[in-house]
C-alpha cells in the first residue's frame, strides 16, 4: 500500500534540497514505563522468547506513528518491580530491581517541505533521535549515600 505518495521531493526538486535536520533531543516514549504488578504476569517462563524467560521479564507495547519511519516501534514494559528468582521463576527477590534499558534510535519524520515564497514542495524527512526501551534488566539497587 502506498501511504506516502508525495514523500520526498516534488518532481524537479533536487534531492540535495531535502531537509535532514539532526535533533539531539531524544523524543520520550508515549507513556512512562511502570512495572506491572499483576501477579500472574510477573514470572519467568521455562520456554518461549527471551523476554518471557528473563528474570526481569518484559512485554512489548506498540508505538505507531504514520508520519514516522519506522512507523512501528516497540517499547519494552517491565512486568515486575523486582527480579524473579532463578530457582522458582515466580518468587520475586527484593535484592534486585527490574529496570528498563533504553536506546536512542534514529527515526525519520515526514514533514511538509517549503520551497521559495513558502510554497509547499512535497515532503521532507527530518532525522530525530527517539528513545526506545529495548528490554528490562535485573540490577542491584542504587545505594543512596
Amino acid at each position: 500500500y502506498s501511504h506516502w505518495p508525495s514523500c520526498c521531493p516534488s518532481k524537479g526538486q533536487d534531492t540535495s534540497e531535502e531537509l535532514l535536520r539532526w535533533s539531539t533531543v531524544p523524543v520520550p516514549p508515549l507513556e512512562p514505563a511502570r512495572p506491572n504488578r499483576h501477579p500472574e504476569s510477573c514470572r519467568a517462563s521455562e520456554d518461549g522468547p527471551l523476554n518471557s524467560r528473563a528474570i526481569s521479564p518484559w512485554r512489548y507495547e506498540l508505538d505507531r506513528d504514520l508520519n514516522r519511519l519506522p512507523q512501528d516501534l516497540y517499547h519494552a514494559r517491565c512486568l515486575c518491580p523486582h527480579c524473579v528468582s532463578l530457582q522458582t521463576g515466580s518468587h520475586m527477590d527484593p535484592r534486585g530491581n527490574s529496570e528498563l534499558l533504553y536506546h536512542n534510535q534514529t527515526v525519520f519524520y515526514r514533514r511538509p517541505c517549503h520551497g521559495e515564497k513558502g510554497t509547499h514542495k512535497g515532503y521532507c524527512l527530518e532525522r530525530r533521535l527517539y528513545r526506545v526501551s529495548l528490554a528490562c534488566v535485573c540490577v542491584r539497587p542504587r545505594v543512596m549515600g
Epitope: 500500500y1 502506498s2 506516502w4 522468547p49 518471557s52 512489548y60 506498540l62 504514520l66 519511519l69 512501528d72
Partner: antibody, heavy 122, light 107 residues
Framework: EVQLQQSGPELVKPGASMKISCKAS????????MNWVKQSHGKNLEWIGL????????SYNQNFKGKATLTVDKSSSTAYMELLSLTSEDSAVYYC???????????????WGQGTSVTVSS | DIQMTQTTSSLSASLGDRVTISCSAS??????LNWYQQKADGTVELLIY???SLHSGVPSRFSGSGSGTDYSLTISNLEPEDIATYYC?????????FGGGTKLEIK
Amino acid sequence: EVQLQQSGPELVKPGASMKISCKASGYSFTDYTMNWVKQSHGKNLEWIGLINPYNGGTSYNQNFKGKATLTVDKSSSTAYMELLSLTSEDSAVYYCAREGYDGYLYFAMDYWGQGTSVTVSS
Amino acid sequence: DIQMTQTTSSLSASLGDRVTISCSASQGISNYLNWYQQKADGTVELLIYYTSSLHSGVPSRFSGSGSGTDYSLTISNLEPEDIATYYCQQYSKLPYTFGGGTKLEIK
C-alpha cells in the same frame, strides 16, 4: 489462500472468563499483525487491540484494557483473545482480522475471521 | 479518540443505480481511511484502503474518494450482491475507529 478460522459460539456465565481462538493459514503467521474487533447488536464495530505474532507486542484500545488479553501461539499459527470477568455488556460477535501491508506501510484489515458469537447469561 | 460518523444509517437504491455512502472524521485523517463490506451472514471484507485504493479481487464498480475529514464510497452500478452494510474505518491514529455503518437495501 489466506484463511482465519475462529472457534465456535460460546455461552458463558457472568463473572467467568473465556478464550477465543483464531487459527491462521495460507500465509506466514509471524509476518502480519492480528487485530481483534467487537460487534455489538449486529451493528457497531469496536477495535479491541492488535498483537504482533513475531514479538508478542500489543496495543489495546483503552476501553478494553483489563477486559481483553491478546496472545499468540506461533507453533500452531493461532491467535487468542481472553475475555475476563464477563458481563452482559460483553455479549457480542468477536472477529479476528489480519492487518495487510506492503513491507513497511501498513494498516488495512485485509482478511477477517468468520466471527465468534459470545453470549453472557446466567 | 477520532470519531467516525456515517450520517446515513440505511439507504435504498435500485439495481443499476449509482450509490454514494459518506463518512466524516472528527479531525483530519490524511486519507488514512478504509472501507469494509459486511454481508447479512456476518462475513466482512475489505473493499478500499487508503481512501481510494481497490483491494485485490474487489470489482471496479467500487471506488473511494475524499480528503481531510470527508470521505465517500461509490458503487457505480449496483448489483444484487452489493446488498450489505458498509463501514468506514480510520487508521490515522490508534485506537482504530469505525463509522456506525450504512445498510444498503434494494428498492
